[in-house]
């Protein structure tokens, strides 16, 4: 009879045992051990024992022990059972970001382990179980299907195998994959909302807008705003679920045109957009032309007013004939037309808008100089020793210098408050003068004394 | 005892296709995947890809994607490598092996190849 | 891909001598949960290659003790302690821890 112990053996991969093998027999023929592992015997008193050490045990093995005794020949066999935690534990890769509401699957691989009777694979998320299975196939998998909510939010998902071996009177082996950091997060169905100008002209700045709500985390959200090939650089303001980005455009002539204005709004893997045509346009003030803006009084006058060609002027609240970027008119100047101003007004419609623009023009009439009876009186009398204002208004353009003298000499203190006396009395030259010319006019200052009252 | 047996020597004209088998004995089939592994003549050893004999899934190089083709029969227990539209450049030994699917405990035991001649 | 670079190409060695092949990674072989997967190979005239050495130490079933592994990350070494007729081959060491697996181009081992 042969015995071999241990009878059951658990070794970890490339380990070594001590296999010992009896014979009931006192003087067996034969006495040893059949396997493909390394052998190495131990020597022992005694015919009727060996003990074997069997080293780099790889795989489950069963090495046989076997005797050769009168009574005949026998067998026993030891089973070696390997064990070896998985070499690798893994979450099949996944998108960091989850759309909450959508069904995530997570799969588990495990590579390698044995024996697999005891290898458990366990999904979690943090430290809660989701599903536990045996280790079947190579490699190993196990799945399952999680729909995300927004509490998942950074929750750590991982896997987990266990190698329990405690049965054997061994410990529990664990091995636990990489993390997998859920990141969830809500993106509305509807798109950003965008506020901005419909037209706008070339070397002006406008404001645009673009808003949305809903956002889940809103933190994360990433804002684009572009018009055509400009990105713009908005100010974004962050409420609970809502943002806002706000943000300057600058338009020059290369803009010119339609362009899109662009708001797309990036969260997780998912984005929403909103796109806006604006209509880049240039309109210059219409321009006002005077043949002169400065002529002498009966010169004949020629106003233009010349606008963009897609607009229609009115000069002086008279609309173009016929309606266009063109409008004149024709005019002798007369002194009352000095300082007339002539306005031209342009509207061009852009995208549906009118667009208004104006510009005015003055007329300078050189007229004169001009001494009236009406603003310069021939004929004086105050009583003596009584407080007078003597006047005289000339008139023209540019204004004249006026100058009163008696005898050439004797000035009339025009525009001063003076005591009458004798000496006033007399005849003054008033003379007018301008780059328009000269006029003189005779004023008479008669002085009423009261002795002859 | 583990044994991979694979088909016998193939000629082939390119743009032909070729189907190898590697019959597995002597193991729990599924516990292990197959890969395969190409020798030309004055080249190193290629591999070409793997499959899960449990599942079914591969996972192939990149280089070889699109014309090879590895599948299984669990109930034969057996593991084929197709490989289309041959050219000259891929005459060599195609070999069968053993390993984790991930290979992380190396191939430990191999098919004993199959010749493939690709000529006109 | 990774690329594997042994050195001799061929190694000739008296025998009961010692012999020693290096191999050289082109990048990192440790793989992110610390493990390193280079594997050596000795291949038989007319025969498939024969796992020697897996996860850079470890003997496989059946290798005799004077075969052994070492080195970490790029640089890897397969020792021969003395050399007997029947390790004659060409030698190859492996990767499995980048996508794809690679090989290296082999040491041809021969008695001197």
């Known amino acids: 009879q042969t015995s071999v112990s241990p009878s059951k053996v658990i070794l970890p991969r490339g380990g070594s045992v001590l296999v010992t093998c009896s014979t009931s027999c006192d003087q067996p023929k034969l006495l040893g051990i059949e396997t493909p592992l390394p052998k190495k015997e131990l020597l022992l008193p005694g015919n009727n024992r060996k003990v074997y050490e069997l080293s780099n045990v790889q795989e489950d093995s069963q090495p046989m022990c076997y005797s050769n005794c009168p009574d005949g020949q026998s067998t026993a066999k030891t089973f070696l059972t390997v064990y070896w935690t998985p070499e690798r534990v893994e979450l099949a890769p996944l998108p960091s970001w989850q759309p909450v509401g959508k069904n995530l699957t997570l799969r588990c691989q495990v590579e390698g382990g044995a024996p697999r009777a005891n290898l458990t694979v366990v999904l979690l998320r943090g430290e809660k179980e989701l599903k536990r299975e045996p280790a079947v196939g190579e490699p190993a998998e196990v799945t399952t299907t999680v729909l995300v909510r927004r509490d998942h939010h950074g929750a750590n998902f991982s896997c987990r195998t266990e190698l329990d071996l405690r049965p054997q009177g061994l410990e529990l082996f664990e091995n636990t994959s990489a993390p997998y950091q859920l990141q969830t997060f809500v993106l509305p169905a509807t798109p950003p909302q965008l506020v901005s100008p419909r037209v706008l002209e070339v070397d002006t700045q406008g404001t645009v807008v673009c808003s949305l709500d809903g956002l889940f985390p809103v933190s994360e959200a990433q804002v684009h705003l572009a018009l055509g090939d400009q990105r713009l650089n908005p100010t974004v303001t962050y409420g609970n679920d809502s943002f806002s980005a706000k943000a300057s455009v600058s338009v020059t002539a290369e803009d010119e045109g339609t362009q899109r204005l662009t708001c797309a709004v990036i969260l997780g893997n998912q984005s929403q957009e909103t796109l806006q045509t604006v209509t880049i346009y240039s309109f210059p003030a219409p321009n006002v032309i005077l043949t002169k803006p400065e002529v002498s009084e009966g010169t004949e006058v020629t106003v233009k007013c010349e606008a963009h060609p897609r607009a229609k002027v009115t000069l002086n609240g008279v609309p173009a004939q016929p309606l266009g970027p063109r409008a004149q008119l024709l005019l002798k100047a007369t002194p009352e037309d000095n300082g007339r101003s002539f306005s031209c007004s342009a509207t061009l419609e852009v995208a549906g808008q009118l667009i208004h623009k104006n510009q005015t023009r003055e007329l300078r009439v050189l007229y004169g100089p001009r001494l009236d009876e009406r603003d310069c009186p021939g004929n004086w009398t105050w009583p003596e020793n009584s407080q007078q204002t003597p006047m005289c208004q000339a008139w023209g353009n540019p204004l004249p210098e006026l100058k009163c003298l008696k005898d050439g000499t004797f000035p009339l203190p025009i525009g001063e408050s003076v005591t009458v006396t004798r000496d006033l009395e007399g005849t003054y030259l008033c003379r007018a003068r301008s780059t328009q010319g000269e006029v003189t006019r005779k004023v008479t200052v008669n002085v009423l004394s009261p002795r002859y009252e | 005892q583990v044994q991979l047996v694979q088909s016998g020597a193939e000629v082939k004209k390119p743009g032909a296709s070729v189907k190898i088998s590697c019959k597995a004995s002597g193991y729990t089939f599924t516990d292990y995947a197959l890969h395969w592994v190409r020798q030309a003549p004055g080249q190193r050893l290629e591999w070409m890809g793997v499959i899960s004999t449990y599942s079914g899934n591969t996972d192939y190089n990149q280089k070889f994607r699109g014309r090879v083709t590895i599948t299984v029969d669990k109930s034969a227990t057996t593991a084929y490598m197709e490989l289309s539209s041959l050219r000259s450049e891929d005459t060599a030994v195609y070999y069968c092996?053993?390993?984790?699917?991930?290979?992380?405990?190396?191939?430990?035991?191999w098919g004993q190849g199959t010749a493939l001649t690709v000529s006109s | 891909d990774v690329v594997l670079t042994q050195t001799p190409l061929s190694s000739p060695v008296t025998l009961g001598q010692p012999a020693s092949i290096s191999c050289r990674s082109s990048?990192?072989?440790?793989?992110?949960?610390?493990?390193?997967?280079l594997h050596w190979y000795l291949q038989r005239a007319g025969q498939p290659p024969r796992l020697l050495i897996y996860?850079?130490?470890n003997r496989f079933s059946g290798v005799p003790d004077r075969f052994s592994g070492s080195g970490a990350g790029t640089d890897f070494t397969l020792k021969i302690s003395r050399v007997e007729a029947e390790d004659v081959g060409v030698y190859f060491c492996s990767q499995n821890t980048h996508f794809p697996y690679t090989f290296g181009g082999g040491t041809k081992l021969e008695i001197k």
């Open positions: 092996a053993r390993s984790l699917y991930f290979g992380s405990s190396g191939f430990d035991y």
């Open positions: 996860k850079v130490s």
């Open positions: 990048q990192t072989l440790v793989y992110r949960n610390g493990n390193t997967y």
